[in-house]
């Protein structure tokens, strides 16, 4: 569910939402760390209905959800898995 991409593209998110999205509607979450042309961290939620939502990284719900996912992955894997996308 969690993917971290390092790209050389500029910022992808024009508008960000802070509204809670239930997990059953989410296909995957893409995290774009700041840098490489974008001054801010970006979180992109790919939904099962094929639409995409940029989520405010400061939104409480996404921080809580990522913390749960981090705990879950760290209990099953020795280190977090980061998927790199070739620019």
């Amino acid at each position: 569910v969690l993917e971290v991409y390092y790209t050389s593209l500029r910022c992808r998110c024009v508008q960000e939402s802070s509204v809670f999205i239930p997990r059953r509607f989410i296909d995957r979450i893409q995290i774009l760390p700041r840098g490489n042309g974008c001054p801010r961290k970006e979180i992109i939620v790919w939904k099962k209905n094929k639409s995409i939502v940029c989520v405010d990284p400061q939104a409480e719900w996404i921080q809580r959800m990522m913390e749960v996912l981090r705990k879950r992955s760290s209990s099953t894997l020795p280190v977090p898995v980061f998927k790199r996308k070739i620019p």
């Epitope: 802070s18 509204v19 809670f20 999205i21 239930p22 997990r23 059953r24 509607f25 939904k47 099962k48 209905n49 639409s51 409480e60 719900w61 809580r64 959800m65």
Partner: antibody
Framework: EVQLVESGGGLVQPGGSLRLSCAAS????????MSWVRQAPGKGLEWVAE????????NYAPSLKDRFTISRDNAKNSLYLQMNSLRAEDTAVYYC?????????????WGQGTTVTVSS | DIQMTQSPSSLSASVGDRVTITCKVS??????VAWYQQKPGKAPKLLIY???YRYTGVPSRFSGSGSGTDFTFTISSLQPEDIATYYC?????????FGGGTKLEIK
């Protein structure tokens, strides 16, 4: 204007069956999850079931999944609830509701309900 | 199932009063809580989603807050047309569950 119109309610004997329908208009029905929610006389709201646009994901209230079946026909803009082995405690107003998965992620439009009475 | 404990079950208040309803959840539901208003003989209407977001067309006197297991719904200045039963609902996970409702009456 979004409209959800339920039908198919009525009086049925214990052990009997009933099929409820919900006709949708004013929305692109085939894009949305849909739910059934019921309300017994003088009681609160109870979620019954939900179905995704492709009918590939269906979730039920655990206490009802053995007797109730939710389905849909996108070509007819219609949602259905097949209710079998009905009991007195199934007596309620049954509402269909749109499950919005674009903005609110919850039930944002509701029909006016159809009444089901289970009695001998 | 996730249990929603709503309180009070009934409430009498005067026009202009500030009214607060609480919902305690049996497990963490993040901010996946909605609040509905239901008038007698009518279908429920969505007022608040994602714990604190007002739905389209909902007056600003209605507000919500909370996360995790504790949620609050507030009417800042009660109006005669607010007489109804109010329900909290979690949509964090299925089965979706509702609170028992709070019946609001005018003093």
């Amino acid at each position: 204007e979004v409209q959800l119109v339920e039908s198919g309610g009525g009086l049925v004997q214990p052990g009997g069956s009933l099929r409820l329908s919900c006709a949708a208009s004013g929305i692109d029905f085939s894009r949305y999850w849909m739910s059934w929610v019921r309300q017994a006389p003088g009681k609160g709201l109870e979620w019954v079931a939900e179905i995704n646009p492709e009918s590939s994901t269906i979730n039920y209230a655990p206490s009802l999944k053995d007797r109730f079946t939710i389905s849909r026909d996108n070509a007819k803009n219609s949602l259905y609830l097949q209710m079998n082995s009905l009991r007195a405690e199934d007596t309620a107003v049954y509402y269909c509701a749109r499950q919005d998965d674009y903005l609110t992620y919850t039930m944002d439009y509701w029909g006016q309900g159809t009444t089901v009475t289970v009695s001998s | 199932d996730i249990q929603m404990t709503q309180s009070p079950s009934s409430l009498s208040a005067s026009v202009g009063d500030r009214v607060t309803i609480t919902c305690k959840v049996s497990q963490d539901v993040n901010t996946g809580v909605a609040w509905y208003q239901q008038k007698p003989g009518k279908a429920p209407k969505l007022l608040i989603y994602s714990a604190s977001y007002r739905y389209t067309g909902v007056p600003s006197r209605f507000s919500g807050s909370g996360s995790g297991t504790d949620f609050t719904f507030t009417i800042s200045s009660l109006q005669p047309e607010d007489i109804a039963t109010y329900y909290c609902q979690q949509y964090y996970s299925t089965p979706l569950t509702f609170g028992g409702g709070t019946k609001l009456e005018i003093k």
